[in-house]
C-alpha cells in the first residue's frame, strides 16, 4: 500500500526547491525498480516528484491566501513491467500559514456621531479589521485593538474594536475628534503586524446652554409719529448651542408695558421690538421695559440648564415730532340767519399746537368769499346770506403753525343758513282760464295753488283772497280750500264776449310767517262762446285758433 504522512508546505518559501515529504509504496525495496508519477493541477509546474524516491518538492513560492490546498494524484509503476504497483491515489498538500498579512480596516472611512455630554461607557462605533492570514493557525489572525490617539475621551475594547466614551465632552469646547485605532495581529505579541484607521467622531448638540443677552441694556428710539406695528429696533441673545437647540423666543416681562411688544425672528434669532400702541412725546417721552429670552425647545431632562431666563433692560426714548395743530373738535357746525349784515358773528373754532413750544396758530377758510376767520378763530360773514340761494356751506378750515407753516391741519366746517320769512307766497304757475258766455253762477272755473321759497318751520299755510276791487266786482268769487289751494267760481249767470271778453282778477296770497308776507297775483279769465255744449274745451279750442290768427264762423 501507499505510505505517506500528511503534506504541508509553508507559504512564501523563497527557495527554488522545497522538500515537502515522500510518497512511497511499501513494496518499494529501494532498488530503483519503481517509477513515481505526480498528476493533477500543479503537477510539474508547482510540485515535482523524484521519480525514483517519491520525494515531493515545491518548486514555486506559494501563497496560502491565494490557495490553501492542492489535491494531486500519485501513481507508482514497475519499470520492468510498466504496470501500476499501487492503485492511483489522491493526496492533499496543504499550504501552511505564516504571518504575512497585516490587519486591514475594510470599511473605511469611519465616521460616528454621538451626543455631547454622553456618559462614560456610551457606545460610539465599532471598527473591525480583517486579517487575511489563517484564523486557525496560531495567533496569525488574532487581533487586538488599541487607541493610538483619542485619550482621555475615548477607549477601545481590545478584542471587539468597540469604541466607547471614557470622559464627558462638551461640543461647545470642541465639536469633533479624530481617533486613531490600531489593530495588531499575534494578539499583540512580538513580531505582530499592525494596521491603523482613523475615526472621525462628531459631537451632536444637546440643549445644555440657555440663551444669554450680550448687552444688559439696550437703548432704542421711536418717533412719536410711528404707526403701531413699527419695528423700533432689535435685541440679540446668544446661545452656544446650534440648530434647533439655539432657537429662542423673546418676550416682555409681565406688566412691563402695554405699549411695546417683542416678536422673534426665527431666521436670525433676533428679538424685534415693535410698537404696540402709539406713543406721544408730550404725554410720555421715555419708557423702560425688561425683556427675557428662553429656548424654544427644552427637553425635560435638560431643564436644569435653563432654570432662570436671561433678561435685559430696554430704554426707549420717544423722539419729538413737530406735529400739526390739533383742533378742539373733529368738525364744526354753525348756524347763521340769512340776511344778517356783513361782519356778523358765525362761530369760533380753536386749534392748538400739541408740541411743547405751543406755536401760535393762524386760521384760514379755503375757497370762501362768504365767510372770514381771524387769528382767534372767530368766523364772521363777509357777505349777506340768502338761504334760498344756499342753505348749507361745506367749508374747510385750515390751522397753520406760525413758526412752521408746513405744519397744517384741516377740518370740515358746516354752516347752516337759517331761514327768515323774506319771500311772499306766489302762484305755483301762470294761470289763464276760460268762462263760457252761458256759464251759470257758482261754476268752478279754476283751482289755484301757491308756493313760498322760504323754509317753513311748521308746514306752510297760505291764505287766498280777492283784492278789494275784485271783491266789489261780483262776477267771480274765491273759496280758500284750507289746504294751500283755492277755487275760483262764477258769481253770476251769463257773460258777454262782445262786451267783456277778458277779466283780470287780482288774488292776494298771504303766508303764515312772522311777520306774514302777502303777494298780489293776477288770474286772466277769457270769455268764450261755448255753444250749446257748455264745454270749456270748445272754448279753449276757439281761443287757440283766434290766437293763431284764424277766423272762425
Amino acid at each position: 500500500g501507499w505510505v505517506w504522512n500528511q503534506f504541508f508546505v509553508p507559504e512564501e518559501m523563497n527557495t527554488t526547491s522545497h522538500h515537502i515529504g515522500q510518497l512511497r509504496s511499501d513494496l518499494d525495496n529501494g532498488n530503483n525498480s519503481f517509477q513515481y508519477k505526480l498528476l493533477g493541477a500543479g503537477a510539474g509546474s508547482t510540485f515535482i516528484i523524484d521519480e525514483r524516491t517519491g520525494d515531493i518538492y515545491a518548486i514555486q513560492k506559494l501563497d496560502r491566501e491565494e490557495r490553501s490546498l492542492y489535491i494531486l494524484r500519485a501513481q507508482v509503476i514497475d519499470i520492468a513491467t510498466g504496470r501500476a504497483v499501487e492503485p492511483e491515489s489522491e493526496f492533499v498538500i496543504k499550504v501552511s500559514d505564516i504571518n504575512d498579512n497585516e490587519p486591514k480596516f475594510l470599511d473605511e472611512p469611519y465616521e460616528a456621531i454621538v451626543p455631547e455630554m454622553s456618559p462614560e461607557g456610551t457606545l460610539v462605533i465599532q471598527v473591525t479589521a480583517s486579517d487575511a492570514d489563517d484564523p486557525s493557525s496560531g495567533n496569525n489572525a488574532r487581533l487586538l485593538y488599541s487607541l493610538l490617539q483619542g485619550q482621555p475621551y475615548f477607549s477601545v475594547e481590545p478584542t471587539t474594536g468597540v469604541i466607547r466614551i471614557s470622559s464627558k465632552m462638551d461640543r461647545e469646547l470642541q465639536d469633533e475628534y479624530w481617533v486613531i485605532i490600531q489593530a495588531k495581529d499575534m494578539i499583540g505579541q512580538p513580531g505582530a503586524l499592525s494596521g491603523t484607521t482613523s475615526v472621525l467622531i462628531k459631537l451632536s448638540d444637546v440643549n445644555d446652554n440657555k440663551p444669554i443677552f450680550k448687552e444688559s441694556l439696550y437703548r432704542l428710539t421711536v418717533s412719536e409719529s410711528a404707526p403701531t406695528g413699527t419695528s423700533i429696533g432689535t435685541i440679540m441673545a446668544y446661545d452656544n448651542d446650534i440648530g434647533e437647540n439655539a432657537e429662542m423666543d423673546y418676550s416682555i416681562e409681565e406688566d412691563d408695558s402695554q405699549t411695546f411688544d417683542i416678536i422673534t425672528n426665527h431666521e436670525t434669532q433676533e428679538g424685534i421690538v415693535i410698537l404696540k400702541k402709539k406713543v406721544d412725546f408730550e404725554h410720555q417721552n421715555h419708557y423702560g421695559i425688561r425683556a427675557k429670552v428662553k429656548n424654544h425647545h427644552v427637553p425635560e431632562q435638560l431643564m436644569k440648564y435653563h432654570t432662570e431666563a436671561s433678561t435685559t433692560f430696554i430704554k426707549i426714548q420717544v423722539e419729538d415730532v413737530d406735529e400739526p395743530p390739533l383742533f378742539l373738535l373733529p368738525y364744526y357746525v354753525f348756524e347763521v340767519f340769512e340776511e344778517t349784515p356783513q361782519g356778523s358773528f358765525v362761530g369760533v373754532v380753536s386749534a392748538t399746537d400739541p408740541d411743547n413750544r405751543k406755536s401760535p396758530i393762524r386760521y384760514s377758510i379755503t375757497r370762501s368769499k362768504v365767510f372770514n376767520i381771524n387769528d382767534n378763530g372767530t368766523i364772521t360773514t363777509s357777505n349777506s346770506l340768502d338761504r334760498e340761494i344756499s342753505a348749507w356751506y361745506n367749508l374747510s378750515i385750515t390751522a397753520t403753525e406760525k413758526y412752521n407753516i408746513e405744519q397744517i391741519s384741516s377740518i370740515p366746517l358746516y354752516v347752516q343758513v337759517l331761514n327768515i320769512n323774506d319771500h311772499a307766497p306766489e302762484f305755483s304757475q301762470y294761470y289763464e282760464t276760460y268762462v263760457c258766455e252761458n256759464a251759470g253762477s257758482g261754476q268752478v272755473i279754476q283751482t289755484i295753488s301757491a308756493v313760498d321759497r322760504d323754509e317753513s318751520i311748521e308746514e306752510h299755510h297760505f291764505y287766498f283772497n280777492l283784492s278789494v276791487e275784485d271783491t266789489n266786482n261780483s262776477s267771480f268769487t274765491i273759496i280758500d280750500n284750507q289746504d294751500n289751494t283755492a277755487v275760483i267760481l262764477t258769481n253770476r249767470t251769463g257773460f258777454n264776449l262782445q262786451e267783456e271778453p277778458v277779466f283780470y282778477i287780482s288774488i292776494l296770497i298771504a303766508d303764515n310767517g312772522i311777520p306774514s308776507l302777502t303777494s298780489t297775483n293776477t288770474l286772466t279769465i277769457h270769455v268764450c262762446d261755448c255753444g250749446d255744449s257748455g264745454s270749456t274745451q270748445t272754448c279753449q279750442y276757439q281761443e287757440l285758433v283766434l290766437s293763431m290768427g284764424f277766423k272762425t264762423e
Partner: antibody, heavy 120, light 108 residues
Framework: QVQLQESGPGLVKPSQTLSLTCTVS??????????WSWIRQHPGKGLEWIGY???????YYNPSLKSRVTISVDTSKNQFSLKLSSVTAADTAVYYC????????????WGQGTLVTVSS | EIVLTQSPGTLSLSPGERATLSCRAS???????LAWYQQKPGQAPRLLIY???NRATGIPDRFSGSGSGTDFTLTISRLEPEDFAVYYC?????????FGGGTKLEIK
C-alpha cells in the same frame, strides 16, 4: 451577496484589442481564497475558460489563448479586466466574468455576460 | 488537457420523468474538482453541483451528483418545467480548466 457586471464595447474590429471590465459589488475583490475569472461562449457552442487572476496580481491563462490574453486587477475600484489582442471573427462570443473558489475550482457567481462581435 | 465528454448531446424527456446526464473525463479527475452548471437561453450559467455531489445554495434536492475517477453523473429525479436547459460539467483537476460540450435537456 457578491454580484459581477461586465462592461465594454460590443463591437471590435479585426486585429484590434478587445477590452472588457468586470465590476465586483457586494464584496471585496481583495478577499483571499478566490480567483477572478473570464470565460467565453461562442454562439451556440460550449464554454471556454480564458484565465483568472488573484487580487495580488498572479495570473493563470488557458494555454490556447495565453499569447494574446492579459488579465489585470484594480483593487481600489474593485474591478478586474480582460484584454485580448489581435482579434478575429473567431473571437466573437459572449464573455462572462465569474468568481472561482481557488481550492476547488468551481465558478460562482457569474456575471450576466456581454456579447462581443468582431467585425469590420 | 483533460477533455470532458457529455452524453447524450440532447435528451428529450417529459416533466415528471427522471433525467440522467453523463460526463466522462479523458483522465482521472479528483471528485473534489468536478462541478455541474445549468444554463438557460440568454442567461449566464448557474452553479448546481460542486465537488461531484454537493448542491449549491438554493438548488432543489431533486438535483444530485455522483461519480469518481473518469465517470460522473448528474441526476434530476423528477423533471420540472423550469429544468429544461443546457447542462455543463467542468473540471479543475488539471490545467487548463475545462468544460464539457453540454447536454441539452428538452421537453419531449
Amino acid at each position: 451577496q457578491v454580484q459581477l457586471q461586465e462592461s465594454g464595447p460590443g463591437l471590435v474590429k479585426p486585429s484590434q484589442t478587445l477590452s472588457l471590465t468586470c465590476t465586483v459589488s457586494g464584496g471585496s475583490i481583495s478577499s483571499g481564497g478566490y480567483y477572478w475569472s473570464w470565460i467565453r461562449q461562442h454562439p451556440g457552442k460550449g464554454l471556454e475558460w480564458i484565465g483568472y487572476i488573484f487580487y495580488r496580481g498572479r495570473t493563470y491563462y488557458n494555454p490556447s489563448l495565453k499569447s494574446r490574453v492579459t488579465i489585470s486587477v484594480d483593487t481600489s475600484k474593485n474591478q478586474f479586466s480582460l484584454k485580448l489582442s489581435s482579434v478575429t471573427a473567431a473571437d466573437t462570443a459572449v464573455y462572462y466574468c465569474a468568481r472561482v473558489y481557488s481550492n476547488y475550482g468551481w465558478f460562482d457567481p457569474w456575471g450576466q455576460g456581454t456579447l462581443v462581435t468582431v467585425s469590420s | 488537457e483533460i477533455v470532458l465528454t457529455q452524453s447524450p448531446g440532447t435528451l428529450s424527456l417529459s416533466p415528471g420523468e427522471r433525467a440522467t446526464l453523463s460526463c466522462r473525463a479523458s483522465q482521472s479527475v479528483s471528485s473534489s474538482y468536478l462541478a455541474w452548471y445549468q444554463q438557460k437561453p440568454g442567461q449566464a450559467p448557474r452553479l448546481l453541483i460542486y465537488g461531484t455531489s454537493n448542491r449549491a445554495t438554493g438548488i432543489p434536492d431533486r438535483f444530485s451528483g455522483s461519480g469518481s475517477g473518469t465517470d460522473f453523473t448528474l441526476t434530476i429525479s423528477r423533471l420540472e418545467p423550469e429544468d429544461f436547459a443546457v447542462y455543463y460539467c467542468q473540471q479543475y483537476g488539471s490545467s487548463p480548466l475545462t468544460f464539457g460540450g453540454g447536454t441539452k435537456l428538452e421537453i419531449k
